[in-house]
Interface confidence: low
C-alpha cells in the first residue's frame, strides 16, 4: 500500500509533542520501541472524518486512507484495531456495522467538533491548529506538506554505515554528520559523531535483488 | 500533465516581504490535494516552507511560521508564499508543488530569490 | 536539525548496487518519500509509499523500510543516476514535513 488512494483527510494531524524514545529500552531488552507519531486515534479519526460514506468506512477502507497518508498499516495492523476500538468506547466514533475492530464507523457528530483530538496533549499547549480537515471534504487527500524543521528529538541517532557497496565520504552539511561504525558501537556512541571523515572507502558491491512491490 | 510556475521578484531588500505565487495547469487545485512551498538555499538541502489544502488549511514549518503566510486562489488556479522579514539567510532557491502528505510528486522549475540591498 | 538523517555522501561503481539509507524515528509509522536532484534541476520523486514508483522511474530504484530506516536502492547504477538523493516524511508529531539533508551520489 502506499499513498496513492485518496482518503485520507487531507490534512495533517494537530501538532503535538513527539513522545521522547527510549532508546535504551529497545537494547535491554530488545522489546520492539512504540511507534513515534501522532496517536493512530488521529489519524483514525480524520480518515473516517473525511470519507464521504454514508454507512460509515470499513476496516479495510479505513487502512487504505492511513496508507495513503503515509501510515504504515502493516506495521502498525493491531494498533490501528486497539485504536478503533478506544475510539469507540470514547464515543468519538460510532459503529455503524460488525463488532470489534471490524464493521464499519463513522464519526459521532455530536462528540467531533472540527477537529476531534481523541488523544491527550502533552504539555505544552499545543493547540490544533486549524482543522486539519476533519471537517473538509477532499474529492482527493491531498498531500499534506509538513516542515522539516524542528529538531526537537532526541540527539540525531548515529547512522548506520550505508550499504557496503558504498564509499562513504566526507560531508556535506555538518548536520549530517555520521557515526561510520558498525551498528552496535554505532549505538553506544550515538553522539560521539565523528567529524566528517575523508577516507572514502570504496566496497565491492554486491548486487541486491531490488525489492519490488 | 500537471504543470507548475513559479514567478515573482528575483530580487528582494532584507527587512521586506517576499512574495511569489504559484500557477498551477493540468490539474485544478480545488480538486484537492496540498499545494507547497519548498526552499533551497544555493548549495544547501530542501526545506520545507508550508502547505495548504484547496480548501486554505495551511500548515508551516514552525522555525519559518511566524513570518510566513501561504494563500490559495481557486479561481485562478495559483496558490501563494509571503515571507516577511527577509534577510541573506532566505536567499534560495523556491519551489513550488503538488503534495500528498509529505510525497511530493510534481515540482515547479523553481525561482532563485537573492536577498540583498 | 532536521529529523531525518542521510549519509552526506556515498559513491558507487559503474553497474553496481548502492543503498542510501535515512534514518528517523518518524518512519516507525511513516513511509520515506526519495527524491533525485540533479544540478540546476527540481528534484524528481523517484520512490514513495512502501515501494512505489511514479511513471517514468526506471525499475532499478527501489525502497524498503525497516524499523526507523528507510533505504532507497539502486541495483545497477548509471552514470545518470549521480546526483543529490533526499528523503522526506512526516515529522514525529505528524503534523509537519521533513527532508534529509541529502546524499550526493558519485557513479565512479
Known amino acids: 500500500m502506499s499513498e496513492t488512494a485518496p482518503a485520507a483527510p487531507a490534512a495533517a494531524p494537530p501538532a503535538e509533542k513527539a513522545p521522547v524514545k527510549k532508546k535504551a529500552a529497545k537494547k535491554a531488552g530488545g522489546t520492539p520501541r512504540k511507534a513515534s507519531g501522532p496517536p493512530v486515534s488521529e489519524l483514525i479519526t480524520k480518515a473516517v472524518a473525511a470519507s464521504k460514506e454514508r454507512s460509515g468506512v470499513s476496516l479495510a477502507a479505513l487502512k487504505k486512507a492511513l496508507a495513503a497518508a503515509g501510515y504504515d498499516v502493516e506495521k502498525n495492523n493491531s494498533r490501528i484495531k486497539l485504536g478503533l476500538k478506544s475510539l469507540v468506547s470514547k464515543g468519538t466514533l460510532v459503529q455503524t456495522k460488525g463488532t470489534g475492530a471490524s464493521g464499519s464507523f463513522k464519526l459521532n457528530k455530536k462528540a467531533a467538533s472540527g477537529e476531534a483530538k481523541p488523544k491527550v496533549k502533552k504539555a505544552g499547549g499545543t493547540k490544533p491548529k486549524k482543522p486539519v480537515g476533519a471537517a473538509k471534504k477532499p474529492k482527493k487527500a491531498a498531500g499534506g506538506a509538513t516542515p522539516k524543521k524542528s529538531a526537537k528529538k532526541t540527539p540525531k541517532k548515529a547512522k548506520k554505515p550505508a550499504a557496503a557497496t558504498v564509499t562513504k565520504k566526507v560531508a556535506k552539511s555538518p548536520k549530517k554528520a555520521k557515526v561510520a561504525k558498525p551498528k552496535k558501537a554505532a549505538k553506544s556512541a550515538a553522539k560521539a559523531v565523528k567529524p566528517k571523515a575523508a577516507k572514502p572507502k570504496v566496497v565491492k558491491p554486491k548486487k541486491a535483488a531490488p525489492k519490488k512491490k | 500533465q500537471v504543470q507548475l510556475q513559479e514567478s515573482g521578484p528575483g530580487l528582494v531588500k532584507p527587512s521586506e516581504t517576499l512574495s511569489l505565487t504559484c500557477a498551477v495547469s493540468?490539474?485544478?487545485?480545488?480538486?484537492?490535494?496540498?499545494w507547497g512551498w519548498i526552499r533551497q538555499p544555493p548549495g544547501k538541502g530542501l526545506e520545507w516552507i508550508g502547505s495548504?489544502?484547496?480548501?486554505?488549511?495551511?500548515y508551516y514549518n514552525p522555525s519559518l511560521k511566524s513570518r510566513v503566510t501561504i494563500s490559495v486562489d481557486t479561481s485562478k488556479n495559483q496558490f501563494s508564499l509571503k515571507l516577511s522579514s527577509v534577510t541573506a539567510a532566505d536567499t534560495a532557491v523556491y519551489y513550488c508543488?503538488?503534495?500528498?502528505?509529505?510525497?511530493?510528486?510534481?515540482w515547479g522549475q523553481g525561482t532563485l530569490v537573492t536577498v540583498s540591498s | 536539525s532536521s529529523e531525518l538523517t542521510q549519509d552526506p555522501a556515498v559513491s558507487v561503481a559503474l553497474g553496481q548496487t548502492v543503498r542510501i539509507t535515512c534514518q528517523g524515528d518518524?518512519?516507525?509509522?511513516?513511509?520515506a518519500s526519495w527524491y533525485q536532484q540533479k544540478p540546476g534541476q527540481a528534484p524528481v520523486l523517484v520512490i514513495y509509499?512502501?515501494?512505489n514508483r511514479p511513471s517514468g522511474i526506471p525499475d532499478r530504484f527501489s525502497g524498503s523500510s525497516s524499523g526507523n530506516t528507510a533505504s532507497l536502492t539502486i541495483t545497477g547504477a548509471q552514470a545518470e543516476d549521480e546526483a543529490d538523493y533526499y528523503c522526506?516524511?512526516?515529522?514525529?508529531?505528524?503534523?509537519?514535513?521533513?527532508f534529509g539533508g541529502g546524499t550526493k551520489l558519485t557513479v565512479l
Open positions: 509509499g512502501k515501494n
Open positions: 495548504i489544502y484547496h480548501s486554505g488549511s495551511t
Open positions: 518518524s518512519l516507525r509509522s511513516y513511509y
Open positions: 508543488a503538488r503534495g500528498k502528505w509529505s510525497k511530493f510528486d510534481y
Open positions: 493540468g490539474y485544478s487545485i480545488s480538486s484537492g490535494y496540498y
Open positions: 522526506n516524511s512526516r515529522d514525529s508529531s505528524g503534523n509537519h514535513v521533513v
